[in-house]
């Protein structure tokens, strides 16, 4: 059950998709990837206040217990709900190959 | 790709399964659940240092970018990799029914 999408902390402060520009060097990929030289990495960043984009029952439980025991139970965390595939041109022993990765770029986000 | 299971922060400090005992009142369930009266909630708690139990390529990217831009990109987060089902005896308008929830108790954990 995806719960409320209204962020009580103010616009853009809660769990949502962000894009971070990263070079192959930033990612530690320079030795095994040829292209792209730069990746627009989409990732999930932001706070998960009570019931905001709660992914499931577990997230709802976590919210309740975090409220009761904040030092023991962390708040839900903003993570990908799904991914967009991305193709990389990789270096191989013999040259190059194209490889599609299904778990590289976040497509949308939820709290869990 | 589940990466290393060795915790560099010391035993029990990294992402792993914890059990938290919670009453129906703690969970905010007292008005709609009859049984159980208490739940042994299994949840994922702990730090996600570099490559520890990295769930996928996205988690590895997040680790790299967090190292570069710690104020912008958060470290990976400890979340359920899978769940154990649980049955609840629920109050209904007319009485009770049994409902199995597949997303309530964490079974194992990874970093994402």
């Amino acid at each position: 059950a995806r719960n409320g999408d209204h962020c009580p902390l103010g616009p853009g402060r809660c769990c949502r998709l962000h894009t971070v520009r990263a070079s192959l060097e930033d990612l530690g990929w320079a030795d095994w990837v040829l292209s792209p030289r730069e990746v627009q990495v989409t990732m999930c960043i932001g706070a998960c206040p009570s019931q905001f984009r709660a992914a499931n029952m577990h997230a709802q439980i976590k919210t309740s217990l975090h409220r009761l025991k904040p030092d023991t139970v962390p708040a839900p965390c903003c993570v990908p709900a799904s991914y967009n595939p991305m193709v990389l041109i990789q270096k191989t022993d013999t040259g190059v190959s194209l490889q599609t990765y299904d778990d590289l770029l976040a497509k949308d986000c939820h709290c869990i | 790709a589940r990466n290393g299971d060795h915790c560099p922060l010391g035993p029990g400090r990294c992402c792993r399964l914890h059990t938290v005992r919670a009453s129906l009142e703690d969970l905010g369930w007292a008005d709609w659940v009859l049984s159980p009266r208490e739940v042994q909630v299994t949840m994922c708690i702990g730090a996600c240092p570099s490559q520890f139990r990295a769930a996928n390529m996205h988690a590895q990217i997040k680790t790299s970018l967090h190292r570069l831009k710690p104020d912008t990109v958060p470290a990976p987060c400890c979340v359920p990799a899978s769940y154990n089902p649980m049955v609840l005896i629920q109050k209904t308008d007319t009485g009770v029914s049994l409902q199995t929830y597949d997303d309530l108790l964490a079974k194992d954990c990874h970093c994402i």
Epitope: - | L34, S35, P36, N84, P85, M86, V87, L88, I89, V96, L98, T100, L105
Partner: antibody, heavy 118, light 107 residues
Framework: QVTLKESGPGILKPSQTLSLTCSFS??????????VGWIRQPSGKGLEWLAH???????YYNPSLKSHLTISKDTSRNQVFLMITSVDTADTATYYC??????????WGQGTTLTVSS | DIVMTQAQNFMSTSVGDRVSVTCKAS??????VAWYQQKPGQSPKALIY???YRYSGVPDRFTGSGSGTDFTLTISNVQSDDLADYFC?????????FGGGTKLEIK
């Protein structure tokens, strides 16, 4: 759709061992909170609870029969077993298995009849 | 063991009537009582959980009440289909125990 079905030998002689199987579908004994119990009923009489096994392999027995009873399960095959050693004529009854989530027997099998006779 | 006593072995009633089946526990069982119906030649069926909550699919003619030691199953507007044995069960402590049953006869 939840179903349970008991199977047993039908007839035994005194001092023999009774082995009962409960085969079920529509639920899983790997689900937290789920259990299966055995209850028996002599013809024309009341119900007597015998044993219960839980998802986490906790087992509970009726103290009056405990030394004779063993309950076990095969979660992957959706089966629960009850063994009663040294049966006598007082064990003649219909034996039921029932789904027992949090102590509530909401689904029962059709029962299997045991006659103990020399 | 907790003894569950159903004082009336038999009760006779007519279609359309209201009838109350009682059950007494030998010690406090809070509301940890269930009721079951067993029609002739059939296995028991769940009616009531936690003393007063009807199980899903059970007609609202069946009502459970009570706590502590005294419990009642009330059937209002009795139907001919209600001809059955009715058993109470406590699940407050092991071993689970059942009442001896009350056979409802329809005049």
């Amino acid at each position: 759709q939840v179903t349970l079905k008991e199977s047993g030998p039908g007839i035994l002689k005194p001092s023999q061992t009774l082995s009962l199987t409960c085969s079920f579908s529509g639920f899983s004994l790997s689900t937290s909170g789920m259990g299966v119990g055995w209850i028996r009923q002599p013809s024309g009489k009341g119900l007597e609870w015998l044993a219960h096994i839980w998802w986490n392999d906790d087992k509970y027995y009726n103290p009056s029969l405990k030394s004779h009873l063993t309950i076990s399960k095969d979660t992957s095959r959706n089966q629960v077993f009850l063994m009663i050693t040294s049966v006598d004529t007082a064990d003649t009854a219909t034996y039921y298995c029932a789904r027992g989530a949090y102590d509530f027997f909401d689904y029962w099998g059709q029962g299997t009849t045991l006659t103990v006779s020399s | 063991d907790i003894v569950m006593t159903q004082a009336q072995n038999f009760m006779s009633t007519s279609v359309g009537d209201r009838v109350s089946v009682t059950c007494k526990a030998s010690q406090n069982v809070d509301t940890n009582v269930a009721w079951y119906q067993q029609k002739p030649g059939q296995s028991p069926k769940a009616l009531i959980y936690s003393a007063s909550y009807r199980y899903s699919g059970v007609p609202d003619r069946f009502t459970g009440s009570g706590s502590g030691t005294d419990f009642t199953l009330t059937i209002s507007n009795v139907q001919s289909d209600d001809l059955a044995d009715y058993f109470c069960q406590q699940y407050n402590t092991y071993p689970y125990t059942f009442g001896g049953g009350t056979k409802l006869e329809i005049k």
